[in-house]
């Protein structure tokens, strides 16, 4: 187990002519965020294929507004690292996609809008525990500078995070054949308990007795290199003329999966889908109870208190299989409607909605009066592709949810005093004025500029404005 860390140093115009226009403007201020997607191996995979090693989304960067006439500078970046935790061994070779997203902060109805500014991709070799590797990638006229590294989480150490460290049993030195764990010099390597003969360079194990191969190696002891060149025959003996090394039988030939497991080939070797009650690389581990921790990827184990009763793994979002061992590509379902963008955050699926839409799947049209009610007796008014609420007296805000102060606008003229009232406001007029808002002077001869006041209402009495 460990963490892949990505530090973005700068994102801005690349060298050479044709500098890109600033993605933000005074009218449409914006900010950036980044998404990284990691896949094991060096395969040329489509951008849409699942991020099998994991993915991460950065925080939003500071808001940026373009200075008119100025060229687009390096844009302000989010703070902090992007971190992608990995549960299994670090594969040593990996593919990455780094996307730069723009969040527009204009006054669109329904909040901000997102658009992809740039996408860079690459394939790299990287040992865990090594120093930061620096990189520069270009996408069109944009340039992205970044560093990355993979580090192991204790107690794992080594270039693949497969060796384990344990506190020393003796104060001075480690046991026979065991080295101190750099950089944790007060700890010692735990003895490896992989299958006898498992290649120490190309194999690793996560459970006693198994031998799992790193990228590029196969065979029961991970001693057979997998060909990376293209061969005429998909299987068969190695060809001396092409220098092509291909394992003879296919990885699923003879079905290596025990206990009724079904075998499927993978780019790296094979994968067993085990029936409930069995797990392990070849479904060889049986009599499993919840105490054995059979549920992977944070799955919750239920039942199975004894070997005869079956357990059930309740998988977290993004995983499936009887042991939560399979990652689901949930964005392939295309759950986001109305042009929303699907982001698989690992633990959750998020739709980034276009302006004017909202909801878990962007199903809610904010521009549509039919899909939005105005509170407290307000009425919805459509116009120009947007909606607004015309609020009843005493209420305000986008949805008429806020209680408005009817006196805030100082509606009483000529020094009249305003009083809020459940049905509106009341003006108490200064001497010499009358009317609902004290707008009419009382004539010196006693006649007013208004029609005669209703019986019982003297000039200067409070006038209720309804």
């Amino acid at each position: 187990a460990g963490v892949f860390e990505l530090q973005i140093h700068s994102f801005g115009p690349g060298p050479g002519p044709g500098a890109p226009r600033s993605p933000c403007s005074a009218r449409l201020p914006c900010r950036l965020f980044f998404r990284v997607c990691l896949k094991p191996g060096l395969s040329e995979e489509a951008a849409e294929s699942p991020c099998a090693l994991g993915a991460a989304l950065s925080a939003r960067g500071p808001v940026y507004t373009e200075q008119p006439g100025a060229p687009a500078p390096d844009l302000p970046l989010p703070d902090g690292l992007l971190q992608v935790p990995f549960r299994d061994a670090w594969p040593g070779t990996f593919s990455f996609i780094i996307e730069t997203w723009r969040e527009e902060l204009g006054d669109q109805i329904g909040g901000p809008a997102w658009s992809l500014l740039a996408r860079v991709a690459g394939r790299r070799r990287l040992a865990a525990g090594g120093p930061w590797a620096r990189d520069i990638q270009r996408a069109g006229a944009w340039e992205l500078r970044f560093s990355y590294r993979a580090r192991c989480e204790p107690p794992a150490v080594g270039t693949a995070c497969t060796r384990l460290c344990r506190p020393r049993s003796a104060p001075s030195r480690c046991g026979p054949g065991l080295r101190p764990c750099a950089p944790l010099e007060d700890e010692c390597e735990a003895p490896l308990v992989c299958r006898a003969g498992c290649s120490p360079e190309h194999g690793f194990c996560e459970q006693p007795g198994e031998c799992r191969c790193l990228e590029g190696w196969t065979g029961p002891l991970c001693t057979v290199p997998v060909s990376t060149s293209s061969c005429l025959s998909p299987r068969g003996p190695s060809s001396a003329t092409t220098g092509c090394l291909v394992p003879g039988p296919g990885p699923c030939d003879g079905n290596p999966c025990a206990n009724g497991g079904s075998c499927s080939e993978t780019p790296r070797s094979f994968e067993c889908t085990c029936p409930r009650g069995f797990y392990g690389l070849r479904c060889e581990v049986s009599g499993v109870t919840c105490a054995d921790g059979p549920c992977f990827n944070g799955g919750l184990c239920v039942g199975g208190a004894d070997p005869d009763s079956a357990y059930i793994c309740h998988c977290p979002p993004g995983f499936q299989g009887s042991n939560c061992e399979k990652r689901v590509d949930r964005c392939s379902l295309q759950p986001c409607r109305n042009g929303g963008l699907c982001l698989d955050l690992g633990h959750a699926l998020r739709c980034r909605c276009r302006a004017g839409f909202a909801g878990p799947r962007c199903e809610h049209d904010l521009d549509d009066c039919a899909g939005r009610a105005c509170a407290n007796g307000g009425t919805c008014v459509e116009g120009g592709g947007a909606h607004r609420c015309s609020c009843a007296l005493g209420f305000g805000g986008r949805d008429c949810r806020e209680r408005a102060d009817p006196c805030a606008a100082r509606p009483c003229a000529h020094g009249g005093r305003c009083y809020a009232h459940f049905s509106g406001l009341v003006c108490a007029c200064a001497p010499g004025y009358m009317g609902a808002r004290c707008e009419f002077p009382v004539h010196p001869d006693g006649a007013s500029a208004l029609p005669a006041a209703p019986p019982g209402l003297r000039p200067g009495d409070p006038q209720r404005y309804l």
Partner: antibody, heavy 118, light 112 residues
Framework: EVQLQQSGAELVRPGALVKLSCKAS????????IHWVKQRPELGLEWIGW????????IYDPKFQDKASITADTSSNTAYLHLSSLTSEGTAVYYC???????????WGQGTLVTVSS | DIVMSQSPSSLAVSVGEKVTMRCKSS????????????LAWYQQKPGQSPKLLIY???TRESGVPDRFTGSGSGTDFTLTISSVKAEDLAVYFC????????FGGGTKLEIK
């Protein structure tokens, strides 16, 4: 482990206001929408509305538009349901539930019983 | 608003029997772009919160026994329990998440 922990039972007078809370743990609060659902005996489940904690946007069933207000506090990973002008029809169990783009109401709180009585 | 109707409102069966309950929506829940039905089924046992069983009309939630099957498309949907167990005693609700959210009135499953 994902959990939605709701506040305790409430006994309120008719016409009063009540504020129910729903504290999320075990997941990134901002990545999920939080819904509120009302359940009265023999009357099934009624959806009140949702909030997106990332931006505070809330949408309501028009039937609850004047009665309910949903807010969220991302610093404490808590969503709130404010109910106003309560009548005897407000007596119910109120549930919060979380939803992302893939799963509908995958996780539910344990429910809060609100009793409106004079 | 989309109205959800469930039938029957209650039914009593013996352990081991097959059960079918229906849910009908007042408008189609099928989204043409992804050919998915925005419908879920929930189980609510006495004194408990509802629990998600089926989503996208036919996808079984992780950990839900395979005796539960969701089917249907458009406006007509079915939840089938192939062989009822005593622990299946509950009320079953359908819910649309195509627009706003609305639940059916529920089907109460009792064990004879």
């Amino acid at each position: 482990e994902v959990q939605l922990q709701q506040s305790g039972a409430e006994l309120v007078r008719p016409g009063a206001l009540v504020k129910l809370s729903c504290k999320a743990s075990g997941f990134n609060f901002k990545d999920y929408y939080i819904h509120w659902v009302k359940q009265r005996p023999e009357l099934g489940l009624e959806w009140i509305g949702w909030i997106d904690p990332e931006n505070g946007n809330a949408i309501y069933d028009p039937k609850f538009q004047d009665k309910a207000s949903i807010t969220a506090d991302t610093s404490s990973n808590t969503a709130y349901l404010h109910l106003s002008s309560l009548t005897s029809e407000g007596t119910a169990v109120y549930y919060c539930a979380s939803e992302d783009a893939y799963y509908p109401f995958a996780y539910w709180g344990q429910g809060t019983l609100v009793t409106v009585s004079s | 608003d989309i109205v959800m109707s469930q039938s029957p409102s209650s039914l009593a069966v013996s352990v081991g029997e097959k059960v079918t309950m229906r849910c009908k929506s007042s408008q189609s829940l099928l989204y043409s772009s992804n050919q998915k039905n925005y419908l879920a089924w929930y189980q609510q046992k006495p004194g408990q919160s509802p629990k998600l069983l089926i989503y996208w009309a036919s996808t079984r939630e992780s950990g839900v026994p395979d005796r539960f099957t969701g089917s249907g498309s458009g406006t007509d949907f079915t939840l089938t329990i192939s062989s009822v167990k005593a622990e299946d005693l509950a009320v079953y609700f359908c819910q649309q998440y195509y627009s706003y959210r609305t639940f059916g009135g529920g089907t109460k499953l009792e064990i004879k």
